[in-house]
């Protein structure tokens, strides 16, 4: 190698200056004894290199780029050799921003996967490789005192969520949770959440069913629907409240909400509906009165109300 570039920093804040030095060794005798070192950033020649001969016979050129406005570029030093430019060395320069503080960190406890799933917003693009780590610890109190650390959770590339598996959780005890973002220009940390995984439990909705007509039960009245629901298995012993929504299948009517219904009811007669009309119904539930998150709405159940019973008109004949 005849030349070697060294830079003040290969990664800088976008728009910051950068200084580079290119040294050509003396033993490159096939070169012009007083070669002119040229600088190129990407495809563009860069003026302003200050060249000097050092005491050991090597040639050095120093350049300061006042603002690096490219997020990624190659800086090279070269010599004119004949009619072509001979590249001596090149370095990759990166520019970007330190990571912003990750925000909107929130977590859900999923009893199906037995894991705590946390997500966040990473903030603006840094233009640099930036790693995110979900960090947590167990705490007996309100997270002022740190207990055992929990293994870091590292999301897959490009993802802004991570799952802490059951073996690292302690239910009914608080955990301190935060996100750390890190790149070559710095580190930032989100505000810390302090939560009991069970207080962020997200239930799955019950399964809505048509109530099987029993011989002794009266059929539904006109404008009424009889429903039942099957509770979600992992939530059998969790106190919940539920709500139902319904709308006619045809037309532009918006959803009408009915609730709260105790999950324990397991069946319900919904009245005040239009007779002989097809309705779409959904149900959702939340842990209650303890904290939790609403489940998603259940898959739709489609039912039709019965027709209004015929009324008998008595015709009076006048003689």
């Amino acid at each position: 190698e005849c030349g070697h570039i060294s830079v003040s920093a290969p990664i800088v804040h976008l728009g910051d200056p950068i200084t580079a030095s290119c040294i050509i060794k003396q033993n490159c005798s096939h070169l012009d004894p007083e070669p002119q070192i040229l600088w190129r950033l990407g495809a563009e020649l860069q003026p302003g290199g200050r060249q000097q001969r050092l005491s050991d016979g090597t040639q050095e050129s120093i350049i300061t780029l006042p603002h690096l406005n490219h997020t990624q570029a190659f800086l090279s030093c070269a010599l004119n050799w004949g009619n072509s430019l001979q590249i001596l060395d090149q370095v990759e320069l990166r520019a970007g921003y330190p990571p912003a503080i990750p925000h909107n960190l929130s977590c859900l406890m999923n009893l199906t996967t037995s894991s705590l799933i946390c997500q966040w917003e990473p903030g603006p693009e840094t233009h640099l490789p930036t790693s995110f780590t979900l960090k947590s610890f167990k705490s007996r109190g309100n997270c002022q005192t740190q207990g055992d650390s929990i293994l870091d959770c590292v999301p897959k590339d490009g993802q802004s969520h991570c799952s802490i598996p059951r073996k690292h959780l302690l239910l009914y005890q608080n955990m301190g949770i935060w996100v750390q973002a890190e790149n070559a220009l710095g580190t930032s940390m989100s505000p810390q959440l302090c939560l009991d995984p069970m207080d962020v439990v997200k239930l799955e909705p019950p399964m809505l069913r048509t109530m099987d007509p029993s011989p002794e039960a009266a059929p539904p009245q006109a404008g009424c629907l009889q429903l039942s629901w099957e509770p979600w298995q992992p939530g059998l012993h969790i106190n919940q409240k539920c709500e139902l929504r319904h709308k006619p299948q045809r037309g532009e009517a918006s959803w009408a909400l009915v609730g709260p219904l105790p999950l324990e009811a397991l069946q319900y007669e919904l009245c005040g509906l239009l007779p002989a009309t097809a309705y779409t119904l959904q149900i959702r539930c939340i842990r209650w009165p303890l904290p939790g998150h609403w489940s998603d709405w259940s898959p739709s159940l489609e039912l039709r109300t019965t027709e209004r019973a015929p009324t008998h008109h008595h015709h009076h004949h006048h003689h």
Partner: antibody
């Protein structure tokens, strides 16, 4: 401190009836499922029945279905087990227990012995 | 109904030994598996719930693992007060069945 105190056990003839009570204190009784678990002499634990916080759901073990009735009075913080048509195989220590949200028996009473014998 | 099979039904061990008890469910129960300790003449005591969560006040030498159908209770270093009978229980269904128990005796 959670306390569960069973009462009502004793000696009863086959075919007879008995009503067990469990007085609860130290927690908000109306928020928790409660249950009865029994243990025959020298045997393992057997789930008998449980009851949801407001009493609307009451599953039973097949061995007692139709003979035993679980109930609760949230105003009195008391759990009950009405046992009818008792058989010799119902002889056991009956434990009252408080269930957690994930179905675990978090707290247990000291137990009351029911002996069915002629 | 879900059957719970515990093994071994009894074992002899010495103080300081590592002891492992297994529990198998006849169908998948996710993580809904609890472990209890019972000493003669006493009510059972909850040790571990939801397969691996240590109940408050239970020494850290007790640990639980597994999911689906196969579960394990481990006592890392048996202490004199650990000689007792241990039961597993599934809470996946309303009918919360118990295993047959494992009696841990002094060798």
């Amino acid at each position: 401190e959670v306390q569960l105190l069973e009462s009502g056990g004793g000696l009863v003839q086959p075919g007879g009836s008995l009503r067990l009570s469990c007085a609860a204190s130290g927690f908000t009784f109306s928020l928790y499922w409660m249950g009865w678990v029994r243990q025959a002499p020298g045997k393992g634990l057997e789930w008998v029945s449980s009851i949801s916080s407001s009493g609307g759901v009451t599953p039973y073990a097949d061995s007692v279905k139709g003979r035993f009735t679980i109930s609760r009075d949230n105003s009195k913080n008391t759990l009950y087990l009405q046992m009818n048509s008792l058989r010799a195989e119902d002889t056991a220590v009956y434990y009252c227990a408080k269930l957690g949200e994930l179905g675990m028996y978090m707290n247990w009473g000291q137990g009351t012995l029911v002996t069915v014998s002629s | 109904d879900i059957q719970m099979t515990q093994s071994p039904s009894s074992l002899s061990a010495s103080v300081g030994d590592r002891v492992t008890i297994t529990c198998r469910a006849s169908q998948g129960i996710s993580s809904y598996l609890n472990w209890y300790q019972q000493k003669p003449g006493k009510a059972p005591k909850l040790l571990i719930y939801y397969a691996s969560n240590l109940q408050n006040g239970v020494p850290s030498r007790f640990s639980g693992s597994g999911s689906g159908t196969d579960f394990t209770l481990t006592i890392s270093s048996l202490q004199p007060e650990d000689f007792a009978t241990y039961y597993c229980q599934q809470s996946w269904t309303y009918g919360q069945t118990f295993g047959g128990g494992t009696k841990v005796e002094i060798k």
